[in-house]
């Protein structure tokens, strides 16, 4: 979009179940009838138009002009539609990955899940509830990043070698928090400063390490919009 | 072309009736929702009435609710608007118009309006 | 319902000027904003909708902006064929509303 016309922005990590939520605000008379509630999502790809399934032609529509600022918009499509009577409709190559979450429906949650969420998926998203009496829609951006932890120096280790882990996600703003933390038998164990491990940020320095510390280390990084992403290394220290 | 046109307005009595008519021409009619918007004499712009594509979901505005019905034949690429107990304030152009997208809301087809008078 | 409230209700300009008009609505509804060009005894033109995006065949000198609450129709350099109403429309939800209006009138 141009600048200064920006819909609000969700963080799914690639390989990863995404939620896309659309809890519209439903005025309590209505609550009853959400049975009867229809919705539609649909989904405009940021590049490059995904290919058309057989059988299933994109919706109808005008395809306007886009902002100046760029090339031709790829064609939006129909990811899901729910009928009033539950009747399902959608694109066939997404169907398997994309749910509405029956029960949620039900109370007013309209969120679409992707499961997992794929690079192409990433877009602007609508979707538009039709109430008895009234509709309302959603929209969100979804915006996709690749979730990384790496050792320097690489590959196996030796007894008293140092190592630095870095945790990374592909996403423009800072992590409001890390948290490290090793997988052991009973369960996620915390990594706390010490002379053994030095936090820094999305970095954690292992001055020298030992047999002991082989196996899986993780980090969580949580963003202030509430978005985690949790990353697993499987570090190795030759006795 | 894309194209709409209205039929049927006219002058009226209040508590009178009168139906409106809309023939749709250049595009697959039953592909979309349409709707009535309407504008009295120097007024702004109100809309009046919406029914999807399949005719599963119709809304009205209140001022219109109970009194205005909105109804498609797509076999006759057609809409209607049948408008009962009219009253002074009904007084307006009534524009048909084609809704972008059943899950879009904006309006990129207008018909050239018909006018609806509603006077003793 | 969500008000849409136009500023200014008329403005004055010359060929060339640049013209901004705006939308202040009374709930957020993101990006969903239409624009429409009226000529006196002429049906509505669709220019701008979802905020940003021109319609087909609208000319450049056409542009809008805004999310939330707070939008923005402008035109680059007024041309005489751009004397008209104007009007916004919120289509995020129903019932849906426009503007009053604002009339764009020769200096």
């Known amino acids: 979009l141009q600048p200064g016309a920006e819909v609000p922005v969700v963080w799914a990590q690639e390989g990863a179940p995404a939620q896309l939520p659309c809890s519209p605000t439903i005025p309590l008379q209505d609550l009853s009838l959400l049975r009867r509630a229809g919705v539609t999502w649909q989904h405009q790809p940021d590049s490059g138009p995904p290919a058309a399934a057989p059988g299933h032609p994109l919706a109808p529509g005008p395809h306007p002009a886009a902002p100046s600022s760029w090339g031709p918009r790829p064609r939006r499509y129909t990811v899901l539609s729910v009928g009033p009577g539950g009747l399902r409709s959608g694109r066939l190559p997404l169907q398997p990955r994309v749910q509405l979450d029956e029960r949620g429906r039900q109370r007013g949650d309209f969120s679409l899940w992707l499961r997992p969420a794929r690079r192409a998926d990433a877009g602007e998203y609508r979707a538009a509830v039709h109430l008895r009496d009234r509709a309302l829609s959603c929209r969100l951006r979804l915006r996709l990043g690749q979730a990384s932890m790496t050792a320097s120096p690489p590959g196996s280790l030796r007894a008293s070698d140092w190592v630095i882990l870095n945790c990374s996600f592909s996403r423009p703003d800072r992590p409001a928090s890390v948290h490290w933390f090793r997988n052991r038998g009973q369960g996620r164990v915390p990594v706390r400063e010490s002379p053994h491990h030095h936090l820094a940020e999305s970095f954690l320095f292992l001055p020298q390490v030992s047999p002991m510390d082989s196996g899986p280390w993780g980090c969580i990084l949580t963003y202030r919009d509430g978005f985690n992403v949790s990353i697993m290394y499987n570090l190795t220290v030759l006795g | 072309q894309v194209q709409l046109v209205e039929s049927g307005g006219g002058l009226v009595k209040p508590g009178g009736s009168l139906r409106l008519s809309c023939a749709a021409s250049?595009?697959?009619?039953?592909?979309?929702?349409m709707s009535w918007i309407r504008q009295a004499p120097g007024k702004g712009l109100e809309w009046v009435a919406y029914?999807?594509?399949?005719?599963?979901?119709?809304y009205y505005a209140d001022t219109v609710k109970g009194r205005f019905t909105i109804s498609r034949d797509d076999a006759k690429n057609s809409l209607y608007l049948q408008m009962n107990s009219l009253r002074a304030e009904d007084t307006a152009m009534y524009y048909c118009?084609?809704?972008?997208?059943?899950?879009?809301?904006?309006?990129?087809?207008w018909g050239q309006g018909a006018l609806v008078t509603v006077s003793s | 319902d969500i008000q849409m409230t136009q500023s200014p209700s008329s403005v004055s300009a010359s060929v060339g000027d640049r013209v901004t008009i705006t939308c202040k609505a009374s709930?957020?509804?993101?990006?969903?904003v239409a624009w429409y060009q009226q000529k006196p005894g002429k049906a509505p033109k669709l220019l701008i909708y979802?905020?940003?995006y021109r319609y087909t065949g609208v000319p450049s000198r056409f542009s809008g902006s805004g999310s939330g609450t707070d939008f923005t129709l402008t035109i680059s350099s007024l041309q005489p064929e751009d004397f008209a109403t104007y009007y916004c429309?919120?289509?995020?939800?129903?019932?849906?509303?426009f503007g009053q209006g604002t009339k764009l009138e020769i200096k």
């Open positions: 029914v999807t594509s399949g005719g599963d979901y119709i």
């Open positions: 709930q957020d509804v993101t990006t969903a």
């Open positions: 250049g595009f697959t009619f039953s592909s979309y929702a």
């Open positions: 118009t084609r809704v972008a997208y059943d899950y879009e809301w904006y309006f990129d087809v």
């Open positions: 429309q919120q289509h995020d939800s129903s019932p849906w509303t």
């Open positions: 979802s905020a940003s």
